[in-house]
Interface confidence: medium
Amino acid sequence: MASAGMQILGVVLTLLGWVNGLVSCALPMWKVTAFIGNSIVVAQVVWEGLWMSCVVQSTGQMQCKVYDSLLALPQDLQAARALCVIALLVALFGLLVYLAGAKCTTCVEEKDSKARLVLTSGIVFVISGVLTLIPVCWTAHAIIRDFYNPLVAEAQKRELGASLYLGWAASGLLLLGGGLLCCTCPSGGSQGPSHYMARYSTSAPAISRGPSEYPTKNYV
């Protein structure tokens, strides 16, 4: 039962991570105009995303425009776009794999196979989390590098936008959720054939260990 709870928690976390990742990729707030203290550094507030950029004039008027063409964009932006889309698709694939192996579905009857599918989905979610992390960290690195580069004019200095924080959250949730799904597999296969248990023998003592085996100084 605890295993089923872990699975549900894991998949909920990954779903939250996927939604966060989708919002992060879509919002034009990867790079935002730098502020120093309370004063804005540039006359035009600029938001730059993977798909579009927006500018807010000092009058308060805001305009957004989707990037004109793919090939004219910088290569790092193209790579970030690609990784974002791949990460989201990989996570969706992980969800399909999980649904096939979930305790509450009948796509696969064997507990052994179910456990394998849940483990696979966990690994896929972890991969998705890493893929999400790459463009976010790369962009953050570029922003910080430029911010402290004296050759970059102040108008072109940027700060970390909300999309990057959402991206980090998405990556963390995908990694955590995927990790939980991986952890549920040993117990998921505990009633299965003995060769399956042997594969996860390192986990067995932690599951069967009784209170008496813990140091007594931890107990009142």
Epitope: S53, L151, V152
Partner: antibody, heavy 123, light 106 residues
Framework: EVQLVQSGAEVKKPGASVKVSCKAS????????MNWVRQAPGQGLEWMGE????????TYNQKFKARVTITRDTSTSTAYMELSSLRSEDTAVYYC????????????????WGQGTLVTVSS | DIQMTQSPSSLSASVGDRVTITCQAS??????LNWYQQKPGKAPKLLIY???KLEDGVPSRFSGSGSGTDFTFTISSLQPEDFATYYC????????FGQGTKVEIK
């Protein structure tokens, strides 16, 4: 219509200072950076510096940093460029130019330019 | 500082010719490059921004390409009014102009 109108030609002696003005109209002055670019006779263009009219903060080309001062007066929508310790090689046409951000390309450009002010340094 | 090497420094061409000017940055400037046209006694005029985007009102015979360190500016069919000096300008790190290319009548 966006317009940048600069002050008239100046003749200065070596060691003196010159202050060139650039009056902006047709747009919100505080909404766009103002840049200064110079061009010596028969030579190429050389960026000198820029000012954020909203805050007054400036960025200068290292080559001119010790001698150039860019200021602005928001009440009259005018930017100023003062160059001190003039020498003969400072004889040039000085331009002010507005910086704009181009949506859809993550790019800036100097889109509108003043007519230029000829500064002649001669003893 | 970033150096912008523009070539050739001058060229002679006839009306209808295809003209190509190159600009090389000493380090990557991404797509942060503009092209300007300047006629004698006049202020420069923006033709291309973002390395390849045509400014509004600029004829389609003008085009730009490139990213990183190598950029190309092309006039597909030279017209009489195109005889002028052309400059590249990077704005990735401050602003740096190329030395200029004077396009003269052959």
């Amino acid at each position: 219509e966006v317009q940048l109108v600069q002050s008239g030609a100046e003749v200065k002696k070596p060691g003196a200072s010159v202050k060139v003005s650039c009056k902006a109209s047709g747009y919100t002055f505080t909404g766009y950076y103002m840049n200064w670019v110079r061009q010596a006779p028969g030579q190429g263009l050389e960026w000198m510096g820029e000012i954020n009219p909203a805050t007054g903060s400036t960025t200068y080309n290292q080559k001119f940093k010790a001698r150039v001062t860019i200021t602005r007066d928001t009440s009259t929508s005018t930017a100023y460029m003062e160059l001190s310790s003039l020498r003969s090689e400072d004889t040039a046409v000085y331009y002010c130019a507005r910086r704009d951000y181009y949506l859809g390309s993550n790019s800036y450009a100097l889109d509108y330019w003043g007519q230029g002010t000829l500064v002649t340094v001669s003893s | 500082d970033i150096q912008m090497t523009q070539s050739p420094s001058s060229l002679s061409a006839s009306v209808g010719d295809r003209v190509t000017i190159t600009c090389q940055a000493s380090q990557s400037v991404s797509n942060n490059l503009n092209w300007y046209q300047q006629k004698p006694g006049k202020a420069p005029k923006l033709l291309i921004y973002g390395a390849s985007k045509l400014e509004d009102g600029v004829p389609s015979r003008f085009s730009g390409s490139g990213s990183g360190t190598d950029f190309t500016f092309t006039i597909s069919s030279l017209q009489p009014e195109d005889f002028a000096t052309y400059y590249c300008l990077q704005h990735r790190y401050m602003w740096t102009f190329g030395q200029g290319t004077k396009v003269e009548i052959k």
